[in-house]
Amino acid sequence: WELTILHTNDVHSRLEQTSEDSSKCVNASRCMGGVARLFTKVQQIRRAEPNVLLLDAGDQYQGTIWFTVYKGAEVAHFMNALRYDAMALGNHEFDNGVEGLIEPLLKEAKFPILSANIKAKGPLASQISGLYLPYKVLPVGDEVVGIVGYTSKETPFLSNPGTNLVFEDEITALQPEVDKLKTLNVNKIIALGHSGFEMDKLIAQKVRGVDVVVGGHSNTFLYTGNPPSKEVPAGKYPFIVTSDDGRKVPVVQAYAFGKYLGYLKIEFDERGNVISSHGNPILLNSSIPEDPSIKADINKWRIKLDNYSTQELGKTIVYLDGSSQSCRFRECNMGNLICDAMINNNLRHTDEMFWNHVSMCILNGGGIRSPIDERNNGTITWENLAAVLPFGGTFDLVQLKGSTLKKAFEHSVHRYGQSTGEFLQVGGIHVVYDLSRKPGDRVVKLDVLCTKCRVPSYDPLKMDEVYKVILPNFLANGGDGFQMIKDELLRHDSGDQDINVVSTYISKMKVIYPAVEGRIK
């Protein structure tokens, strides 16, 4: 019995087509992805093949103005229109709190939303009961397929799930649910979830009875053969894991941002064993036309976004200096504002011993592309922020050793004076440079804000200690020459859309007046 699994993950609000790098579409003839194009391909496959499932492995939320404005209603609407069969909860589905998940998505979705390792307690338990499920048995042709969901247990550190949701260990939570499916005579089981490729592989290895793993979170690109675009494969598609009980379990993921549609064909025998698995992600490029009815719907929803862009978010009573003459040479107050917003967006009081789980921010000065003048009645709009942060990146959470941070700050000034983008703006860090010294030895003082303290204060950086840092995804991926970050990071979780982080902070503060205050000397 042959099953076709179509899958997406980490779409992050890319409802409209995007450029090849998943930023805003400029030249339509070269754009990719988007739900209208995705629907065309999905329908084509549904017409050609008998047993098809369309699955999403989480993180539909967060990433563009679509989410900022519609807050998840757009996800429910367009996923319903595409007739998704199931979705797993990702960490970003909790970005607007549990209410921001329940009302726009859980109550509106016409497909099951899954996670076996999230357990509700207290008053939330009855409120959310039945709105998401640990598993769902889906009829597919003559057969039935069990889908069991999972979500990163790091979600409390990455999003805002509140105190009434417990995130259990994925493997511990999945096993009894899979066992339950087996007792219901369901012998074809897909684990669909959002914990990253390493955990996907562990689930394939450790959870008895799981036949296929469809994952997300790590934006992993897998491909067999010559890849069709710029993404470099992390392995073959599907990636085959040998389970502890001796089965070959295919593991798949489909990069991110709706650029690809994962396409996996599985042949099962009567016992539910995977006899064969093959496929590849399908690049959703301009050779695939956008479905006209979905496109018309997108255009209708688009109108509200254009109006939103010009509305006031808050006010500044000071000039927000985002000029390259400042931000690439010295501490600039736009850099301070953005870093403060980044830390504020990551306030998670999950442990009494820590005032917060992260206190530090670094930001490449070259990523700040425009100032904001306060003399326009102090008004700050989304449009203004889009000029400051035009690249559509995210502010991510990483774990780095102190020694890596020291290297990063040396790199920040290794060719100081040439107006290059690698000069770092900071938050929760005091750095002193001596530019008379030779490159690679210019950081003379590096103090960082404590986290395991009730009164935050600055302590010298310890080389062997592991620190959490918020930074742009551009830096996490080694951009502006920060190869040491990419090579040495111990953990990387993608965060919220950069503009959204700053806009939320400004809306929260109402009036802002960031200063230059001696963070960088």
Epitope: W1, G141, D142, E143, T242, G246, K248, D269, E270, R271, N273, V274, I275, S276
Partner: antibody, heavy 114, light 107 residues
């Protein structure tokens, strides 16, 4: 649990035909295939062909084409293998086996003798 | 048709021995290979499917490996109940073909 139950032993004269049945249970019958395999006394296994339960599509080994006929009765989840123009070398145990031979019938002995 | 050449045709071994049986295909069969066990009473049982996946209930001393045209069944430590005849089966293309079998006997 998958189960395949075959019909009993048969003794046939040369030139006659034999029809062996295989009743399946424990799975969604219409979604799969059934294979037929023969084993002559003291010999190895030989694949005869397969039938798709849902629409009756068949594929035969060249050696058995024209003499073997596979049919299906969806209402009783039963598959049949008819072998015509029997000769002494058709004396063998005939097995039905699921799509990828994960489960086997107990075998049906067919003896061809004058 | 794809020919499957299985070797050895028979072998004698003692309990606890490591036993290896090979099947060579006349052309590339990908991963489309099963290993079957037939006990003297005639009952057939699949041990390995898709070259290396172990069927449920089959002891972990059985393992399969290989690719292309060369495939191996290994019994890491032979047990008394393992004395039987073993067959490989390719299902890469029609007609499906079996190896000639390997009879594992007590030394």
């Amino acid at each position: 649990e998958v189960q395949l139950v075959q019909s009993g032993a048969e003794v046939k004269k040369p030139g006659a035909s034999v029809k062996v049945s295989c009743k399946a249970s424990g799975y969604t019958f219409t979604a799969y295939f059934m294979n037929w395999v023969m084993q002559a006394p003291g010999q190895g296994l030989e694949w005869i062909g397969r039938i798709y339960h849902n629409n009756g599509d068949t594929f035969y080994s060249q050696k058995f084409k024209g003499r073997a006929t596979l049919t299906v009765d969806k209402s009783t989840s039963t598959v049949y293998m008819e072998l015509s123009s029997l000769r002494s070398e058709d004396t063998a145990v005939y097995y039905c086996a699921t799509s990828y031979v994960g489960d086997w019938g107990q075998g049906t002995t067919v003896t061809v003798s004058s | 048709d794809i020919q499957m050449t299985q070797s050895p045709s028979s072998l004698s071994a003692s309990v606890g021995d490591r036993v290896t049986i090979t099947c060579r295909a006349s052309q590339d069969i990908g991963d489309s290979l099963n290993w079957l066990q037939q006990k003297p009473g005639g009952a057939l049982k699949r041990l390995i499917y898709a070259t290396s996946s172990l069927d449920s209930g089959v002891p972990s001393r059985f393992s399969g490996s290989g690719s292309g045209t060369e495939y191996t069944l290994t019994i890491s430590s032979l047990q008394p109940e393992d004395f039987a005849t073993y067959y490989c089966l390719q299902y890469a293309s029609f007609p499906w073909t079996f190896g000639g079998g390997t009879k594992v006997e007590i030394k």
